[in-house]
């Protein structure tokens, strides 16, 4: 009986073994097929049309103080994707802004030569003819046009003729509006931060990138104007002039923007000097915005050479005056505040000069001169509070000029002398002009570059003009690098696990089954 009993249990065991092995085989087979298909699908989707057809684009930013040339590069077959365009080169043109060439337009061609030749070197010759070139002029040229449309037009005409001589696909030179400058700056930083992407990200490669798709506001400071652009909480605007509507990648954005002409750092300084010299008792201007011991002679004719100082213009009993620095942050701050008229506001809330400003919302990227100045002062860290920034500015401005010159021997004196004013101006503009507070200060991120591309309006301008920002989300969005890596690793692991289990099943003795049953 015992033998019969043993035989029956052996049969049962054999049946169970067969049953289990069949099921496990089926499961393993199915899993491995799925994993292989998934790996192939992910691999093929990600690496479709592999021969990399690279495209290039050139944008010249003709600012008030200088001109910069930017070269961008992107894979042709991915040009509607988010974040695929990146900057490969920046070339700073030697000399002032193009508006300064109004009396010597014949020199513009030579002025642009070096950077255009650099573009010729960087971009492969085979790509030259299909590389678009755009020149956008900003507030310096807006100011010149206020004086004379013909003068501004003449400068642009010579610029166009010069740029047409190169082998690229020249697309024109124009003065962009303040609204465009603000909007394109906003597009640039949000494009680079991946805010227009609808993909879920497992990890972030961009330091300021958050997992949510809330866009960043843009704060841009130039030499002659400053722009503020963001998506406010309340979508209804009191001032249609400041409202923009975009549809980008299938999502609607209602954006507030304003450009304050004459409130760039250079023109703000001219305004301040013109205002302060009105009350000077003689040809000496004791200025708290310059370091103690600093001296500089200014021609009155230069002071009034800009439409920005018109409101302070008066006849002075001297042709020149001398700035004598006294280095006092608090007094400098008070002097700067007088440039902002906050007594008049026809809206529920204003920035200054009667310009509507909705309540601030979200994080802001502060770039261009906001970044350059704060970076020089070593105040761009996220950890530095507004109180600390003010404290550092007080300390910096009070340092004697001779000491400053020694500490920063490599910096041009013209620029070095103005950091006290510029830093103070930035604080005043952000706090009193735009109503940031000590608490909301932490929402300001001083940004120079994002993933190697300069923050500024030029990239957004090119993306728009080359139709690389679709209104609708592209149908088949290729995976982000992080998603691709994650899926490849996941399905590879599935295959490895399947293989290990398979090996264990078919190379283990029968007691393995006893343990399992």
């Amino acid at each position: 009986m015992k033998g019969t009993k043993d035989l029956t249990s052996q049969q049962k065991e054999s049946n169970v073994k067969t049953f289990c092995s069949k099921n496990i085989l089926a499961i393993l087979g199915f899993s491995s097929i799925i994993a292989v298909i998934a790996l192939l699908a992910v691999g093929l989707t990600q690496n479709k049309a592999l021969p990399e057809n690279i495209k290039y684009g050139i944008v010249l930013d003709a600012g008030s103080s200088h001109t910069s040339l930017y070269i961008y590069k992107w894979p042709a077959e991915k040009e509607n994707d988010t974040g695929v365009v990146h900057q490969v080169e920046e070339c700073r043109v030697k000399g002032p802004g193009i508006s300064k060439y109004v009396q010597k337009v014949n020199e513009i061609g030579i002025y642009l030569t070096d950077c255009m030749e650099r573009a010729r070197e960087v971009i492969p010759r085979s790509q030259h003819q299909e590389t678009p070139v755009y020149l956008g002029a900003t507030a310096g040229m807006r100011l010149l046009r206020m004086e004379s449309e013909e003068l501004a037009d003449r400068v642009l005409d010579v610029v166009e003729r010069s740029l047409s001589n190169y082998p690229f696909d020249f697309q024109g030179a124009r003065i962009i509006t303040g609204q465009e400058e603000g909007a394109y700056g906003w597009i640039t930083i949000n494009y680079l931060l991946g805010k227009f992407s609808q993909k879920t990200r497992w990890f972030s490669i961009v330091p300021y990138e958050t997992n949510n798709q809330e866009t960043f506001g843009a704060l841009d400071l130039g030499g002659a104007s400053t722009q503020i652009t963001f998506v406010p909480q309340n979508q209804t605007t009191e001032s249609p002039d400041n409202a923009l509507q975009f549809r980008l990648y299938g999502k609607d954005y209602n954006v507030y923007t304003h450009s304050f002409l004459c409130y760039g750092k250079d023109q703000a300084l001219w305004q301040k000097l013109a205002k302060d010299i009105q009350v000077a008792s003689n040809e000496i201007l004791r200025d708290p915005c310059f370091h103690p011991g600093y001296k500089k002679v200014v021609n009155v004719s230069d002071l009034y050479k800009t439409p920005c100082t018109k409101r302070f213009e008066m006849t002075l009993p001297f042709q020149q005056f001398e700035i004598q620095g006294i280095g006092n942050y608090q007094q400098c701050h008070q002097s700067v505040l007088e440039l902002f008229n906050t007594s008049y506001c026809p809206y529920s809330q204003c920035a200054f000069n009667g310009i509507f400003l909705p309540p601030l919302q979200g994080d802001f990227g502060a770039f261009s001169a906001f970044y350059f100045v704060m970076n020089f002062l070593n105040l761009t860290s996220e950890k530095v509070s507004q109180e600390k920034v003010t404290e550092m500015m007080k300390k910096f401005c009070s340092q004697p000029w001779e000491e400053i010159k020694t500490s920063y021997a490599g910096v041009k004196e013209k620029y070095l002398s103005e950091y006290c004013f510029s830093g103070t101006y930035i604080l005043s503009l952000l706090l009193q002009g735009y109503h940031f507070t000590a608490d909301s200060w932490e929402h300001i991120h001083f940004i120079g570059k994002i993933q190697g591309s300069d923050a500024g309006w030029t990239l957004g301008y090119m993306l728009n003009l080359t139709n690389m920002i679709p209104a609708e989300q592209p149908l088949s969005t290729p995976l982000s690098h992080s998603t691709y890596v994650f899926l490849m690793v996941l399905f590879s692991l599935v295959l490895v696990i399947v293989a290990i289990i398979g090996l264990l099943i078919f190379h283990k003795p029968s007691y393995f089954w006893k343990d399992m049953v």
């Epitope: 004086e147 004379s148 013909e150 003068l151 501004a152 050479k305 800009t306 439409p307």
Partner: antibody
């Protein structure tokens, strides 16, 4: 209303100097570019010199370059033309003229003119 | 410099008729062309600015057209007060005037 009144004309010997003035009223003087245009007896109009609103651009006709100087005093709402090394061919009625505007932008055309002041260069 | 050539030098027209005055620039001046009227013993008066814009206070019978190098001033129905000398002026380069067209009573 806009008014431009020239003064300072007269008879002067060749090689000598003369200063013309143009008193402006009825508009914000420092917001506009100003010009001198002349007209020789029985002849057409000839532009002489321009001074843009913010002194960004000061320009002269080749015929007067190096001899004439345009200037302005915004506190006095006055435009000047300092003429030196005068020649017989400088004899003309000298008009003061204001730059026009294209909307918010300045324009190099002349929307208001004074009645002119006669300058005669003769020995 | 940009040379402006006006034609004809003299134009004889009867009141109520249409008058067409031409101005040619030696090089392209975009639309920076302006027209003035001058009567004997008076200062010039702006009629048209930037090729086709009517200056304030100027009757609608005056109109301007053209761009580049060829420009036209048209007076649709001549009135007695329209008989005068007409000048064109370009402002693309430093200002230059045409030699004038004398519009006289036929």
């Amino acid at each position: 209303q806009v008014q431009l009144v020239e003064s300072g004309g007269g008879v002067v010997q060749p090689g000598r100097s003369l200063r013309l003035s143009c008193a402006a009223s009825g508009f914000t003087f420092n917001n506009y570019g100003m010009n001198w245009v002349r007209q020789a007896p029985g002849k057409g109009l000839e532009w002489v010199a321009s001074f843009s609103s913010s002194s960004t651009y000061i320009s002269y006709a080749d015929t007067v370059k190096g001899r004439f100087t345009i200037s302005r005093d915004n506190s006095k709402n006055t435009l000047y033309l300092q003429m030196s090394s005068l020649r017989a061919e400088d004899t003309a009625v000298y008009y003061c003229a204001r730059h026009g505007r294209y909307g918010g932008y300045g324009g190099f055309y002349f929307d208001y003119w004074g009645q002119g002041t006669m300058v005669t260069v003769s020995s | 410099e940009t040379v402006m050539t006006q034609s004809p030098a003299t134009l004889s027209v009867s009141p109520g008729e249409r008058a067409t005055l031409s101005c040619r620039a030696s090089e392209g001046v975009k639309s920076y062309m302006h027209w003035y009227q001058q009567k004997p013993g008076q200062a010039p008066r702006l009629l048209i600015y930037k090729a086709s814009n009517l200056a304030s206070g100027i009757p609608a019978r005056f109109s301007g057209s053209g761009s580049g190098t060829e420009f036209t001033l048209t007076i649709s129905s001549l009135q007695s007060e329209d008989f005068a000398v007409y000048y064109c002026q370009q402002s693309w380069n430093d200002p230059t005037f045409g030699q004038g067209t004398k519009l006289e009573l036929k």
